[in-house]
Interface confidence: medium
């Protein structure tokens, strides 16, 4: 299922994540208890063509929605989470509240605001850089964008947006942030680990050896201080002090999709019980920051002749 | 305010051991990239080592598996342990925080080890 | 390992001259370069980092410019506390190196 998220007491939109191009009417229903979701706008929460509406959204509203498009041949559904956050008392944004990541390496750049286009807003949508409002000249606010002349590092930040939403002669606030970092003709960027999954649970053999490999991107070019390891219960390796456990000597350069990884390979010698109880942690770190990803082992459970 | 202390230094003789500690304030610091940077009397500035909270280490080929950089988060305190010294490793060694863009953006008073018999 | 290197390694400058030093790194470095000014006895200063971003704090007659290879420290205005050694660093790749320095002397 899609996830969409708004803050109480704003404005929130979402549409069905099965639409496509699809022109067929669109049924909304709690996913818990199938209620259908009335089209009548004096209702906090509506339907309108394939949208939902929540004006103004609650913490309570947060759930799984569900939406039927009927067409004669064939009805899709598809499941949205929705999830409605308190307004942050201080100016951290945190992540979950967070749009995606705008890269910029050109002088002049601009950036979007997201999720706009499902509102009835009207100009000037007003910006705001780690909580203050831009008002230099640089800073330039138009139609959904804001434009950045002569970009540099120091540009990097969150950026909110705010705008109005105009329903029923009535207005709403809505505010949504996005992080933008400057990159070089190559770029640098926060870890993505794309191996092991999060929280993924490895079957291995006891007393049989196992490896582990934790793979991790960069960006491309520069890789500063790019490192992919584990730990253990939250120790380094090294200093875990079980000595047939080891993370292999050396990092495996490569490339995906055009990006610059490392690869760090995690061995057990010959897996014993207490090692199913222990947390293993892939970490990848750069000068942006740091992600880890844990992962467990379980025992192979074994194959059923029968 | 950003600070940095390091300590630690002083004479030894070739082979000894010597352990230097930083003490940082002001910021951040279980965030944060650490180094340690050294300077030889008249010379220019050369990296040592740097360490990550993550356990993350890298060391210059010069000190590699004689010098260990660890830290205290608890603390707030940047270690260098440096053994089997030798004249070379001579110089005043400066604690720096790593920021924004790489650059080293807050740096310590820095500490002196001589290395002599 | 990137090789940095500075030129000229020494200059003679009076008070209110425009002075510029130029880094040259072994390979492409794309922006990730650093500016330190140093004084005799002190620890070094951070002045520019990514090539062109000036360090808070630092005066606006210091800037920086270039990528790739080719960089340039330049002090639009020297005043007397500019006297000093002036370093670059690189931080496109680990191990991070220095430049060997440029020392500014009264002329």
């Known amino acids: 299922s899609k996830s969409s998220w708004g803050l109480e007491n704003e404005a929130l939109i979402v549409r069905c994540p099965q639409r496509g191009r699809s022109t067929y009417p669109v049924e909304w229903y709690y996913s818990d208890t199938n209620e259908s979701i009335p089209t009548q706008k004096r209702n906090r929460i509506f339907v309108s063509r394939d949208r939902l509406k929540f004006l103004p959204a609650r913490v309570e509203d947060s759930g799984i929605y569900a939406c039927v498009i009927r067409s004669p041949n064939l009805n899709k559904t598809g499941y949205l989470n929705v999830t409605i956050h308190k307004k942050p008392p201080s100016c951290n944004i945190p992540d979950y509240l967070m749009y995606s990541t705008v890269r910029g390496s050109d002088k002049n750049f601009k950036i979007t605001c997201p999720t706009i286009d499902l509102y009835n807003w009207t100009a000037p949508v007003q910006w705001f850089k780690n909580c203050k409002a831009l008002q230099e000249p640089r800073f330039r606010a138009h139609r959904s964008y804001l434009f950045i002349d002569n970009v540099t590092h120091d540009d990097e930040g969150d950026y909110t947006c705010q705008f109005t939403h105009a329903e029923n002669g009535t207005n709403y606030i809505v505010t949504a942030t996005r992080s933008f970092t400057v990159e070089e003709k190559g770029f640098s960027m926060f870890p993505v680990i794309t191996n092991p999954p999060y929280n993924h649970t490895m079957e291995v053999e006891i007393g049989k050896p196992a490896s582990i490999a934790c793979s991790a991107c960069f960006g491309k070019g520069s890789h500063f201080l790019a490192d992919v390891l584990w730990q253990i219960n939250k120790t380094v390796v090294g200093n875990f002090g079980e000595a047939r456990i080891q993370e292999e000597e050396g990092r495996n350069e490569s490339s995906s999709n055009d990006m610059d990884c490392l690869t760090s390979v995690l061995r057990i010698t010959g897996v014993t019980e207490k090692d199913l109880s222990l947390e293993y942690d892939c970490l990848a770190l750069n000068l942006h920051g740091m992600i880890r990803h844990t992962i467990r082992l379980r025992r192979k459970q074994p194959i059923d002749h029968r | 305010e950003v600070q940095l202390l390091e300590s630690g230094g002083g004479l030894v003789q070739p082979g000894g051991s010597l352990r230097l500690s930083c003490a940082a304030s002001?910021?951040?610091?279980?965030?944060?990239?650490m180094s340690w940077v050294r300077q030889a009397p008249g010379k220019g500035l050369e990296w040592v080592s740097v360490?990550?909270?993550?356990?993350?280490?890298f060391y210059a080929d010069s000190v590699k598996g004689r010098f260990t950089i660890s830290r205290d988060n608890s603390k707030n305190t940047l270690y260098l342990q440096m053994n089997s010294l030798r004249a070379e490793d001579t110089a005043v060694y400066y604690c720096?925080?790593?920021?924004?863009?790489?650059?080293?953006?807050?740096w310590g008073q820095g500490t002196l080890v001589t290395v002599s018999s | 390992d990137i090789q940095m290197t500075q030129s000229p390694s020494s200059l003679s400058a009076s008070v209110g001259d425009r002075v510029t030093i130029t880094c040259r790194a072994s390979?492409?470095?794309?922006?990730?370069l650093a500016w330190y000014q140093q004084k005799p006895g002190k620890a070094p200063k951070l002045l520019i980092y990514?090539?062109?971003s000036l360090q808070s704090g630092v005066p606006s007659r210091f800037s920086g410019s270039g990528s790739g290879t080719d960089f340039t420290l330049t002090i639009s205005s020297l005043q007397p506390e500019d006297f000093a050694t002036y370093y670059c660093?690189?931080?496109?790749?680990?191990?991070?190196?220095f430049g060997q320095g440029t020392k500014v002397e009264i002329k």
């Open positions: 360490i990550h909270s993550g356990g993350s280490t």
């Open positions: 990514a090539a062109s």
């Open positions: 002001g910021f951040s610091f279980s965030h944060a990239w």
């Open positions: 720096a925080r790593i920021g924004k863009g790489g650059g080293f953006d807050y």
């Open positions: 390979q492409d470095i794309g922006s990730w």
């Open positions: 660093q690189q931080s496109y790749s680990t191990p991070p190196t």
